[in-house]
Interface confidence: medium
């Protein structure tokens, strides 16, 4: 049994880091493998992660972490029974994938303005709370070409757009994702999408 693709890990910079790797053949990850991880810190203890299958030869493990600070470094040991298959390390702050925003809501009752709001996925005491920026994706269910991205580079988790920038009388969906420039993170997953029917009063045309 050998590791074909070494584990790569990303952290949500809060409580979970996810590591993925591939073996050289079909493997029952949860029964055959264990990923041991330990914070390089005098008071820390080793923890064991039981991997799950992620395709025939792929494995994924969700490492639980109390909290994360930028100086943290973890040792990782991948075991198959008594055999050490791979040894490495992982610095969460250098491999951050933020949590996805939640509670995306479209408020349509604000005088021909659409107000989209969502929740910051981090608690206020987390470093990323004040460092997230967002991308909002809006698309038409009827027209695949009607697909747009709005970059929200301010901290407030909201976006206002004129309803008239979208077509009237059809349904739209929106979703939002986050990233943090400070740690050069990857984008988060998209939030669940929300749907609304776009309608607004056409301006009276004078001839």
């Amino acid at each position: 049994m050998k590791v074909l693709q070494e584990p790569t890990c990303v952290s949500d910079y809060m409580s979970i880091s996810t590591c993925e790797w591939k073996m050289n053949g079909p493997t029952n990850c949860s029964t055959e493998l264990r990923l041991l991880y330990q914070l390089v810190f005098l008071l820390s203890e080793a923890h064991t992660c039981i991997p799950e299958n992620n395709g025939g030869a792929g494995c994924v493990c969700h490492l639980l972490m109390d909290d994360v600070v930028s100086a943290d470094n973890y040792t990782l040991d991948l075991w198959a029974g008594q055999q050490l298959l791979w040894k490495g390390s992982f610095k969460p702050s250098e491999h951050v994938k933020p949590r996805a925003p939640g509670n995306l809501t479209v408020h349509t009752n604000v005088s021909d303005t659409l107000l989209l709001t969502w929740s910051n996925p981090y608690p206020p005491d987390n470093y990323l709370y004040n460092h997230l920026t967002y991308a909002v994706n809006i698309w038409s269910e009827n027209d695949p070409a009607d697909f747009r991205i709005y970059n929200v580079t301010y901290l407030e988790p909201s976006l206002r757009i004129a309803a008239s920038t979208l077509k009237s009388g059809i349904s739209y969906r929106a979703r939002v994702r986050a990233w943090a420039q400070c740690y050069n993170t990857t984008w988060s997953e998209w939030s669940p999408s929300t749907k609304w029917h776009n309608s607004y009063r056409e301006p009276f045309e004078q001839h």
Epitope: V40, F41, L42, L43, S44, D66, D67, V69, S70, A71, D72, N73
Partner: antibody, heavy 120, light 106 residues
Amino acid sequence: QVQLVQSGAEVKKPGASVKVSCKASGSTLTDDYINWVRQAPGQRLEWVGWIFPGNGNSYYNEKFKDRATLTVDKSASTAYMELSSLRSEDTAVYFCARGLVRYRALFDYWGQGTLVTVSS
Amino acid sequence: DIQMTQSPSSLSASVGDRVTITCRASSSINYMHWYQQKPGKAPKPWIYAASNLASGVPSRFSGSGSGTDFTLTISSLQPEDFATYYCQQWSSYPITFGQGTKVEIK
């Protein structure tokens, strides 16, 4: 809100022992490392050792290993530091302080300090 | 033992000044903490793990550094900031503190 309340000032003769208490409220002490730190007049802070009440494990600064004893009474939420064979250079304010792994062992709560004076 | 050396040992500054205190470890460490102490009082936690402000610490304070060199910076000194600041390491035993930096009013 966690509070650490220490026993009152002590005056001791050289060669004697002193036992300082540190009572915790708002915390069960279970997940806390209770540290003892001293500060002689005008000097830097000096770490004596820690005790982990969850299992009674303790760890000492080699400098104090032979003279300091750290204990805990979990039922009373109280930690103790006993220092024996006192000498004049042990005159200092002794603090208890909680260290949490979550904050990478930052001492986040401190007692008010107990002045121990060693004088003949 | 890892020796922690702070510089300067004391400094005089005026309200509004930018102040930087440095702490050098005699060998590389992974976690550095800072405390503020006022006369007759216990130290208060100020910055943990080099750069994270402890609860209630004003945002004019910041911390940085890694390895052997760490800094505490006050962007605009306020009257309540006059105190002694200590660095501390818990990366190897024994836990050690710097000798302190006393920030005084000019």
